[in-house]
């Protein structure tokens, strides 16, 4: 189960000349409003047809009056969204017409009049759950452009509306075999409870054990696909496995129809009707326009209605191919520059940046040092984002802040004792050692294994180091 | 208001080839869709190539291999290659750029194809 939703920008003149007069005037002011009607599947059927989808009428729109002599501009429209809930899955392919109607408000007798403006009609491909598509449609000289989505009503969820969503019983993770439902990440997806082989993709189900099929497959699971060819002739009964069963010869045998088209009978021949994307007598010429929905995830088609014109689709961000059908991974293209985190937020593209820069791209790195004082004589260095003091003699800390004990890091070896000095360290050495860290033995025939000591110091002395 | 110009429009032989450009204009940008279409006269308006915004092209079943589609984003330009031209190609061939909002038009250039 779930919801189409209409939401209707803006009604008035299209491109061109001819510009069509304003359906209002000063003596006869008038509002309007809007009705959609939905049926599944990409079928041609008259307007009369039932909305098999669901339909719906929008609020009447504030009263227009027109300015004498003023074009007909767009005009004022009705508030919110129109929606249309459907109870079963979403076909993921349908037809709609949009219609527009002005209600009369002159003084006529027995109440407002009503009138049908315009009409469009139009075959889509969408799916549940994905965004908003933006369409324009021409009616003569009306232009109307809106935008429409599918979405899901919990726990339904899916292209088709078909899976379920439960709560998690578990805090951390789904039950074995189940999926976090996405973008419910505290939902698990609920187990399948259809009948047992029930088609996955011509099949859904409400109720346990259940297998319904959606338009164009039939049988106890909805693998049969249905055909149009003489079933319902009196030569034969239908069968389940291939949904027709003719024993005598006619028109439709070996079935003349190409590129997948279904045959009918007619009084004097057959008559094929072609899958999307195919025309002819047998179906034989391929040409995909407008009308066919060719376009993905929200593509505006721009094309001719001739079968020989023609289409290419106006994609929205984050999707490419000729239909739009392709999610751009645009973080592989690796955009946020220094180490910064990208995400595809699907409308957008975001980095992250580590700190020290900024910008979209994390492309700007910011002065580390800008602002940053170093206590006590110590000097800023840049680098990776951070900055860093390095500090004067005596000093330590992020900031320099910190007296260092100089002692801390125990330099003075073999025993030595550390003293610490306004200019660094002195290491007072154990008999035997000598040098700024005590580090050379001293020989027992009193000489030193490196450099001998300065004059007027006894090895064992105190050195200063500086 | 910008506006798409055409040039390139001419006669030419059976047989022979043309190259249409439409630009360069502040118009035509990689984020737009573009287009050429054709009328003739008496018949309504059709797309004959088109690139779109993430670069993918079509043609008019009339005119697979004969005629290519090209854009030049430095330039702001999009041309149309046009070779081994038919009779039936004769008409006004209107160059067109979109995006989600607008859509652009050009005033047309006239191709005609006769012995």
């Known amino acids: 189960a779930g919801v189409f939703e209409l939401q209707i920008h803006s009604f008035g003149p299209g491109p061109g000349p001819g510009a069509p007069r304003s359906p209002c005037s000063a003596r006869l002011p008038c509002r309007l409003f809007f009705r959609v009607c939905l049926k599944p599947g990409l079928s041609e059927e008259a307007a009369e047809s039932p909305c098999a989808l669901g339909a719906a009428l929008s609020a009447r729109g504030p009263v227009y009056t027109e300015q004498p002599g003023a074009p007909a501009p767009d005009l004022p429209l009705p508030d919110g969204l129109l929606q249309v809930p459907f109870r079963d899955a979403w076909p993921g392919t349908f037809s709609f017409i949009i219609e527009t109607w002005r209600e009369e408000l002159g003084d006529q007798i027995g109440g407002p009049a009503w009138s049908l403006l315009a009409r469009v009609a139009g075959r889509r491909r969408l799916a549940a759950g994905g965004p908003w598509a933006r369409d324009i449609q021409r009616a003569g000289a009306w232009e109307l452009r809106f935008s429409y989505r599918a979405r899901c009503e919990p726990p339904a969820v899916g292209t088709a509306c078909t899976r379920l969503c439960r709560p998690r019983s578990a805090p951390s993770r789904c039950g074995p075999g189940l999926r976090p439902c996405a973008p419910l990440e505290d939902e698990c997806e609920a187990p399948l409870v259809c009948r047992a082989g029930c088609s996955p993709e011509h099949g859904f189900c409400e109720q346990p054990g259940e297998c319904r099929c959606l338009e164009g497959w039939t049988g106890p699971l909805c693998t049969v696909p249905v055909s149009t060819s003489s079933c319902l002739s009196p030569r034969g009964p239908s069968s389940a496995t291939t949904g027709c069963l003719v024993p005598g010869p006619g028109p439709c045998d070996g079935n003349p129809c190409a590129n997948g088209g279904s045959c009918s009978e007619t009084p004097r021949s057959f008559e094929c009707t072609c899958p999307r994307g195919f025309y002819g007598l047998r179906c034989e010429v391929s040409g995909v326009t407008c009308a066919d929905g060719p376009c993905f995830n929200g593509g505006l088609c721009v094309g001719g209605a001739d079968p020989d014109s023609a289409y290419i689709c106006h994609c929205p961000p984050g999707f490419q191919g000729s239909n739009c059908e392709k999610r751009v991974d645009r973080c592989s293209l690796q955009p946020c520059r220094n180490g910064g985190l990208c995400l595809d937020l699907g409308h957008a593209l975001r980095c992250r940046c580590r700190a020290g820069f900024a910008g979209p791209r994390c492309e700007h790195d910011l002065d580390d040092c800008a602002g940053r004082a170093c206590a006590n004589g110590g000097t800023c260095v840049e680098g990776g984002g951070a900055h860093r003091c390095s500090c004067a003699l005596g000093f330590g800390g992020r900031d320099c802040r910190e007296r260092a004990d100089p002692c801390a890091a125990r330099p003075c070896a073999h025993g030595g004792r550390c003293y610490a000095h306004f200019s660094g360290l002195v290491c007072a050495c154990a008999p035997g050692y000598m040098g700024a860290r005590c580090e050379f033995p001293v020989h027992p025939d009193g000489a030193s294994a490196l450099p001998a000591a300065p004059p007027g110091l006894r090895p064992g002395d105190p050195q200063r180091y500086l | 208001e910008v506006q798409l110009v055409e040039s390139g429009g001419g006669e030419v032989q059976p047989g022979g080839s043309l190259r249409l450009s439409c630009g360069p204009s502040e118009i035509i940008t990689s984020d737009k869709s573009m287009g050429w279409w054709r009328q003739a006269p008496g018949k309504q308006r059709n797309l004959v190539a088109g690139?779109?915004?993430?670069?993918?092209?079509n043609y008019a079943q009339s005119v697979k291999g004969r005629f290519t589609i090209s854009r030049d984003n430095a330039k702001n330009t999009v041309y149309l290659q046009m070779s081994s031209l038919r009779a039936e190609d004769t008409a006004v061939y209107y160059c067109?750029?979109?995006?989600?909002?607008?859509?652009?038009w050009g005033q047309g250039t006239l191709v005609t194809v006769k012995p």
């Open positions: 690139i779109s915004n993430v670069g993918s092209t």
């Open positions: 067109y750029a979109r995006d989600f909002e607008n859509e652009y």
